[in-house]
């Protein structure tokens, strides 16, 4: 655990960033699914 | 925090700098270098954070390098040229609840043929 | 990356007074600034972090202000001890924004 306050937030940065690419990963996951079944 | 390898080199001859942790972990802290030319101010090269990512002024990149090991950060300095001739600073980050920084009292880079 | 300009370059003051030093980001920072006091041949004391948090063991006499793009440290009741160069540094969103400092402000006391 850090207490540093340049990790703090781009530890936040970080997160977002990992939840955006999880995100994108599946919606293109559906999306390719959804032109598949087409 | 404790700076070395600051010595007079020739323009052009790489440098690589030492900069020794005790007391916390790098695993937890970020750690950055900065640089003061004689009777000059602070500038900021760069960073590297607990996760060994590392970003650097706009003026710094392709220019230096830093990297790290368990108790150790380096600054390394490619090709230098006399403009680099200073005080090479190594500093931990700032804590929120600890309030307060860890700074090296530097070491000097001269540059010069 | 986010430029900080510092004003001004040198100000002296008496024994007891007060020194306005100014900061101003290039750019919205939000309140990610710090202020370092720095006397010769020593490293930088961090003073203020957060824009306006006083870090540890520093005087009350110290107080920051601000945020956005501008920023004020305020030295009041002056004391011999107080004469350095102080240096505000950016830290917001380093990675895109680099973590520029000002170009300082030497202070004298008389």
């Known amino acids: 655990h850090s207490d540093g306050i340049f990790t703090d937030s781009y530890s936040r940065y970080r997160k977002q960033m990992a939840v955006k690419k999880y995100l994108a990963a599946v919606l293109g996951k559906r999306y390719k699914q959804r032109v598949k079944n087409k | 925090v404790e700076e070395s390898g600051g010595r007079l080199v020739t323009p052009g001859t790489p440098l690589t700098l030492t900069c020794t942790v005790s007391g916390f972990s790098l695993s937890s802290y970020a750690m950055i270098w900065v640089r003061q030319a004689p009777g000059k101010g602070l500038e900021w090269i760069g960073i590297?954070?607990?996760?060994?990512d590392t970003y650097y002024a706009s003026w710094a990149k392709g220019r230096f390098t830093i990297s790290k090991t368990s108790t150790t950060v380096y600054l390394k300095i490619a090709s230098p040229t006399t403009e680099d001739t200073a005080t090479y600073f190594c500093a931990r980050e700032p804590g929120s609840t600890t309030q307060n920084d860890l700074w090296g009292q530097g070491t000097l880079v001269t540059v010069s043929s | 990356d986010v430029v900080m300009t510092q004003t001004p370059a040198s100000v002296s003051e008496p024994v007891g007074g007060t020194v306005t030093i100014k900061c101003q980001a290039s750019e919205n920072i939000y309140n990610s600034l710090l202020w370092y006091q720095q006397k010769p041949g020593q490293p930088p004391k961090l003073l203020i972090y957060?824009?306006?948090t006083l870090a540890s063991g520093v005087s009350s006499r110290f107080k920051g202000s601000g945020s956005g793009t501008e920023f004020t440290l305020t030295i009041s009741d002056l004391e011999c001890a107080d004469a350095a160069t102080y240096y505000c540094?950016?830290?917001?969103?380093?990675?895109?924004?680099?973590?520029?400092f000002g170009g300082g402000t030497e202070v004298v006391v008389k």
């Open positions: 957060r824009a306006s």
């Open positions: 540094q950016n830290y917001y969103n380093i990675w895109t924004n680099g973590a520029a």
């Open positions: 590297i954070y607990d996760n060994g």
